[in-house]
């Protein structure tokens, strides 16, 4: 296992409907075909995975379809968009980048991006 | 959009050195990762080295590394492969390549940049 540069942003503040977009950049030590991307969560020392997805280079990343995540890719960057957040999933959400495909298996986790989720507040009732 | 210009190519003595350029005539490059690769006849293309948008982070591949150097200058909208200690077997075509990235990395993979120059020849013989 080789080690690997990963770049991500330090926060990001998801929308009022609970949707945070961030960008995972990767220093591709060589041609690389085939790519898994997982977005992993740390909060309260706990770390579990959040969504993973495959994707062999120039074809579009593709998540499970009951994935909360969604994502494309463009050379050796990754636009991730998280869908479905709560106040309760505020945390550090780590990106990690594994080079499968051909060997030399390389593998980057980057620092994290702070992701902060504000629950909207409802709005209140109306006479109309 | 950017447009690659490479230059500083031609016939060197082994053991000798060269520096070449690699130049937008269009955008500015200070938003782009840029890459070298060079490819002789009848090789595939490989991957020589490669610097971030800012210059702090560069990377080589073992087969060149001490011998050739990446930099670049933002002011100058240009990108530098300095090779020294050149030998018969680095003749071949050299060309840059860029890829817009968000933050300071660079690949040393042909598959991640969309953008190439035309390339400058380099020769080594004596």
């Known amino acids: 296992c080789k080690a690997m540069h990963v770049a991500q942003p330090a926060v990001v503040l998801a929308s009022s409907r609970g949707i945070a977009s961030f960008v995972c950049e990767y220093a591709s030590p060589g041609k690389a075909t085939e790519v898994r991307v997982t977005v992993l969560r740390q909060a309260d020392s706990q770390v579990t995975e959040v969504c993973a997805a495959t994707y062999m280079m120039g074809n579009e990343l593709t998540f499970l379809d009951d994935s909360i995540c969604t994502g494309t890719s463009s050379g050796n960057q990754v636009n991730l968009t998280i869908q479905g957040l709560r106040a309760m999933d505020t945390g550090l959400y780590i990106c990690k980048v594994e080079l499968m495909y051909p060997p030399p298996y390389y593998l980057g986790i980057g620092n994290g991006t702070q992701i902060y989720v504000i629950d909207p507040e409802p709005c209140p009732d109306s006479d109309f | 959009e950017v447009q690659l210009v490479e230059s500083g190519g031609g016939l060197v003595q082994p053991g000798g050195s060269l520096r070449l350029s690699c130049a937008s005539s269009?955008?500015?490059?200070?938003?782009?990762?840029v890459g070298w690769f060079r490819q002789a006849p009848g090789k595939e293309r490989e991957e020589l080295a490669c610097i971030g948008r800012t210059g702090e982070f560069t990377d080589y591949p073992g087969s060149v590394k001490g011998r050739f150097t990446i930099t670049r200058d933002n002011s100058k909208n240009t990108v530098y492969l300095q090779m020294v200690s050149l030998r018969a077997e680095d003749t071949a075509v050299y060309y840059c390549a860029a890829e817009r990235l968000v933050f300071h990395l660079c690949s040393l993979s042909e598959y991640d940049y969309d953008t190439w120059g035309q390339g400058t020849q380099v020769t080594v013989s004596s």
């Open positions: 269009g955008d500015t490059l200070e938003s782009f990762a």
